[in-house]
């Protein structure tokens, strides 16, 4: 006996209760492939999730995160609260980066400043909670009489920090 279910297109399901007739997916459900015996329940975007694409009879809804949150995981399976630059999300909420660390994004963790001396360089611009240090030429390159193929970068104006 031929399986009539294979003829059922996406957006329908094969209704065994009705002699394998192809029935449309009920409201708030979908089938993305043909030959399905059931339709899947549509994803609901609620709370910190907002709808990016409505559910249709042939495709699931897609969610995004509301303002102040960003997606984590495949297909935005989680929403994580944003923090400010210079902060990280901890078990007590958003906390400032500890001295010697920085975060230049609204997400992720605080990372240690670059250790310029490991590369034999000196600190040209100090680090902040929001920005990594900027490494400059090595101290030897800055000693009197040392020649350099390229002139050193001009000093930053006082009172101006990197944006």
């Amino acid at each position: 006996l031929q399986d009539l279910c294979s003829n059922c297109p996406a957006g329908t399901f094969c209704d065994n209760n009705r002699s394998q007739i192809c029935s449309p997916c009920p409201p708030n459900s979908f089938s993305s492939a043909g030959g399905q015996r059931t339709c899947d329940i549509c994803r609901q975007c609620k709370g910190v999730f907002k709808t990016r694409k409505e559910c249709s009879s042939t495709s699931n809804a897609e969610c995004d995160c509301i303002s102040g949150y960003h997606c984590l995981g495949a297909e935005c399976s989680m929403c994580e609260q944003d923090c400010k630059q210079g902060q990280e999300l901890t078990k007590k909420g958003c906390k400032d980066c500890c001295f010697g660390t920085f975060n230049d994004q609204k997400r992720g963790i605080c990372r240690p400043w670059t250790n310029c001396s490991l590369d034999g360089k000196s600190v040209l611009v100090n680090g902040t909670k929001e920005r990594d240090v900027v490494c400059g030429p090595s101290p030897a390159d800055l000693s009197p009489g040392a020649s350099s193929a390229t002139p050193p970068a001009p000093a930053r104006e006082p009172g101006h920090s990197p944006q």
Epitope: C45, G47, S77, M78, E80, L89, T90
Partner: nanobody, 122 residues
Framework: EVDLVESGGGLVQPGGSLRLSCAVS????????MSWARQAPGKEFEWVSS???????YYVDSVKGRFTISRDNAKNTVYLQMSSLKPEDTAVYYC????????????????WGQGTQVTVSS
Amino acid sequence: EVDLVESGGGLVQPGGSLRLSCAVSGFTFSNSAMSWARQAPGKEFEWVSSIYSDGKTYYVDSVKGRFTISRDNAKNTVYLQMSSLKPEDTAVYYCATWKTLRVGVWDESDYWGQGTQVTVSS
């Protein structure tokens, strides 16, 4: 069917107190971590407090010492006792399940209540 129903919101003067309740049905409450979150007018949605199934609690700094989250597993209810209320606490307060157990992170499978309005004004 899972249901979360908040109650206890209202208008209160600065310095006053309110106790929000969230009655839960349709899943095993005693095994579930729960959270409160809020959204003030024109502001972004903010995590407020969370409680693990074992009773361990977390709070955002701005409410620490003023708000207390608690749960009654026999009544399938989570509470938020709010005292020393300030005008900046004015918001819609939402109760939600908390599957990730990570502060400020919610999962797509979490359940949410409809919210209860809290207004702090003289």
